[in-house]
């Protein structure tokens, strides 16, 4: 969490941002809130990116104002116009690109004063893994697949019964480049699995950590997946 305060002249206002991560090819949100004003027409929101000449987005007098917008953000940005009045200056970003990563500044002017806060935005690819029993294999084998990751993640297997065991010798992980030549499909196979045990396939890079669990008993198979973004810090 980054909390910024206004500078000279008028009173300062508090602006708060949260570091976040964007999944390339999907839509992202850069979070920013501020002390609200009574009149929408008195609020100016400017989003800037370090190293970029033009603006990312500007909203003033109740409307978007993109005359100074940088070409790389054309057609890809919007604020939540109906929420600006309550202090939400968060930015919607369409079709997140790797090059969108960097330091952004959320700069606010209201009748109460000015304020700004920076936000670190990471970009990459992350997806939920799915673990299945590989019935084609000669021995009891599990197959963990996740369609989109970038940068290349690490894959670690764990089991409830053999806690702390190292499965690197009995697993094999491969990374297959997807058609857009950036993200990769992750496939990891675990051999010699035993029944009545819960196995976890953990995929992690510097942006996200995802886990796919599978519990195999004689009567049923139970699966569970979850994904967690790393380093979501507020400013």
């Amino acid at each position: 969490l980054i909390i910024g305060f206004g500078i000279s002249g008028r009173h300062s206002i508090t602006v708060t941002t949260v570091a976040s991560a964007g999944n390339i090819g999907e839509d992202g949100i850069l979070s920013c809130t501020f002390e609200p004003d009574i009149k929408l027409s008195d609020i100016v929101i400017q989003w800037l990116k370090e190293g970029v000449l033009g603006l990312v987005h500007e909203f003033k007098e109740g409307k978007d104002e993109l005359s100074e917008q940088d070409e790389m953000f054309r057609g890809r940005t919007a604020v939540f116009a109906d929420q600006v009045i309550v202090g939400n200056a968060s930015l919607r970003l369409k079709n997140v690109q790797l090059t969108d990563a960097g330091t952004y500044k959320c700069y606010i002017i209201t009748s109460k004063g000015k304020g700004n806060a920076n936000l670190e935005y990471k970009t990459g690819a992350f997806s939920m893994p799915e673990v299945n029993v590989d019935y084609n294999a000669s021995s009891e084998t599990l197959r963990c697949e996740a369609p989109r990751w970038f940068p290349q993640p690490t894959v670690v297997w764990a089991s409830q019964v053999d806690q702390g065991a190292n499965f690197s010798e009995v697993s094999n992980t491969s990374f297959e480049l997807n058609s857009e030549n950036v993200t990769m499909k992750v496939v990891s196979v675990l051999y010699n699995v035993t029944i009545n045990n819960t196995y976890s396939c953990m995929i992690e890079n510097d942006i996200a950590k995802a886990t796919g669990d599978i519990k195999v008993t004689e009567s049923e198979i139970k699966r569970r997946s979850h994904l967690q973004l790393l380093n979501s810090k507020a400013s």
Epitope: G25, K63, D64, L66, Q69, G75, T77, A78, K94, N95
Partner: antibody, heavy 121, light 107 residues
Framework: QLQLQESGPGLVKPSETLSLTCTVS??????????WSWIRQHPGKGLEWIGN???????YYNPSLRSRVTMSVDTSKNQFSLKLSSVTAADTAVYYC?????????????WGQGTLVTVSS | DIQMTQSPSTLSASVGDRVTITCRAS??????LAWYQQKPGKAPKLLIY???SLESGVPSRFSGSGSGTEFTLTISSLQPDDFATYYC?????????FGGGTKVEIK
């Protein structure tokens, strides 16, 4: 409500420049929340997006036509224009102007009624 | 450029039928897809935006679904006024592109 109307010559000679204007009524072209587009449709065929313009004059053109396209805007007349140079018979089409829904969502609504431009000597 | 492929190109149906048109993108476009209806000699009319949002004034028999690369437009009960050509369009990234169209004709 917002209405768009295309105007310009219906016949253009090969190698010349096609010029069309879109007049906006019922709203301001200077509303910063929208991009303004040109789209064309060859006879009996599908739709092709030509490009868009913002009220400040910034443009984006479809790379397939970029070398021949120029768009401009006249906020005082509430109009935006399209010029397509070095035309051939392949540029014969119905030309539409349209507004995007927002700065981030460029589904098109409303559209002008379209104007047929024939390229022939 | 992102290629948009519609199927079928022609569809014969009767009043009251449930009609489904498919649009496939050559790469993921998230939910940035619109559907239009066009009648001969007229401009296209926006039906659906953002894959599933119904444009104001469009009858509720029209619905859109899908995300990523696969999308569908469904007309729950075809009416006489619905015989037309339908186009999908992606606005995920420049240059914006349209599908080739699906003509819905009377069986």
């Amino acid at each position: 409500q917002l209405q768009l109307q295309e105007s310009g010559p219906g016949l253009v000679k090969p190698s010349e420049t096609l010029s069309l204007t879109c007049t906006v009524s019922g709203g301001s072209i200077s509303d910063g929340s929208y991009y303004w587009s040109w789209i064309r449709q060859h006879p009996g065929k599908g739709l092709e997006w030509i490009g868009n313009i913002y009220y400040s004059g910034s443009t984006y053109y479809n790379p397939s036509l970029r070398s021949r396209v120029t768009m401009s805007v006249d906020t005082s007349k509430n109009q935006f224009s399209l010029k397509l140079s070095s035309v051939t018979a392949a540029d014969t089409a119905v030309y539409y102007c349209a507004r995007g829904l927002s700065t981030i969502d460029e589904a098109f609504d409303p559209w002008g009624q379209g104007t047929l431009v024939t390229v022939s000597s | 450029d992102i290629q948009m492929t519609q199927s079928p190109s022609t569809l014969s149906a009767s009043v009251g039928d449930r009609v489904t048109i498919t649009c496939r993108a050559s790469q993921s476009i998230s939910s940035w897809l619109a559907w239009y209806q066009q009648k001969p000699g007229k401009a296209p009319k926006l039906l659906i935006y953002k894959a599933s949002s119904l444009e104001s004034g469009v009858p509720s028999r029209f619905s859109g679904s899908g995300s990523g690369t696969e999308f569908t437009l469904t007309i729950s009960s075809l009416q006489p006024d619905d015989f037309a050509t339908y186009y999908c369009q992606q606005d995920n990234s420049y240059p914006y592109t349209f599908g080739g169209g699906t003509k819905v004709e009377i069986k």
